[in-house]
Interface confidence: low
């Protein structure tokens, strides 16, 4: 899958959504989408 960057502060890597440091929330760095959900 193509990589692309959203202004909202995350990328999609092969359908895997990963946080960047500028995002807010209690679960910085957590992987979502691949597991059961979480912050985007």
């Amino acid at each position: 899958d193509a990589e692309f960057r959203h202004d909202s502060g995350y990328e999609v890597h092969h359908q895997k959504l990963v946080f960047f440091a500028e995002d807010v929330g209690s679960n910085k760095g957590a992987i979502i989408g691949l597991m059961v959900g979480g912050v985007v």
Partner: antibody, heavy 121, light 111 residues
């Protein structure tokens, strides 16, 4: 405590649209994605997509071919799922859900009570 | 899209006996040594409830009699000693990639 409260049952005619709401409380609204899952009568579960209350970005199941739109209103901590061009096969209970991140700790889920949408002429 | 197939469709087990449900994915749901496979329980008139995530990890508050195993494409949910309150439909689900997908469900009843 975390709560997701959905809007009430709807009856719609084929070709119409329906907009279901999901009001979140008990946590910081922008911290977790809200997913939508539907279940036709006597059938299994089908994931429709999710929206990010933080960014407003959504990811949809392509099965719905542009018929579904998920939005959020941060001022009321509410997420909306709109499904257009309704057909009889869209008759189902629609659930919103929030899932914890997997971060090596505990994971649990929170679901709305479900909204029955009936499509009938 | 990843297709999830469960077997059997229904299962009747005596109280206190073991129940085993199988789930197969059309392609591997593993990534970085983690299996992105979740199990849900759904009772009539209720929303689903997460039982097992990452193939083997118990959700919060889930009784120890529920366990999950497997990796790659083949997974199993085991109820070690069936209780009356375990009568429900059980679904597997992959969350490796979008769209997330569920198995067709397995109805567990008391024999």
């Amino acid at each position: 405590q975390v709560q997701l409260v959905q809007s009430g049952a709807e009856v719609k005619k084929p070709g119409a649209s329906v907009k279901v709401s999901c009001k979140a409380s008990g946590y910081t609204f922008t911290t977790y994605a809200i997913h939508w899952v539907r279940q036709a009568p006597g059938q299994g579960l089908e994931w429709m997509g999710f929206t990010s209350p933080y960014s407003g970005v959504s990811n949809y199941n392509q099965k719905f071919k542009g018929r579904v739109t998920m939005t959020r209103d941060t001022s009321t901590s509410t997420v909306y799922m709109e499904l257009s061009s309704l057909r009889s096969e869209d008759t189902a209970v629609y659930y919103c859900a929030r899932f914890d991140n997997y971060d090596g700790g505990y994971v649990r889920d929170y679901w709305g009570q479900g909204t029955l949408v009936t499509v009938s002429s | 899209d990843i297709v999830m197939t469960q077997s059997p469709d229904s299962l009747a087990v005596s109280l206190g006996e073991r129940a085993t449900i199988n789930c197969r994915a059309s392609e591997s749901v593993d990534n970085d040594r983690i299996s992105f496979l979740n199990w849900y329980q759904q009772k009539p008139g209720q929303p689903p409830k997460l039982l097992i995530y990452a193939a083997t990890k118990q959700g919060t508050g889930v009784p120890d009699r529920f366990s999950g195993s497997g990796s790659g494409t083949d997974f199993t949910l085991t109820i070690s000693s069936l209780q009356a309150e375990d009568v429900a439909v059980y679904y597997c689900q992959q969350s490796k990639e979008f769209p997330w997908s569920f198995g067709g469900g397995t109805k567990v009843e008391i024999k």
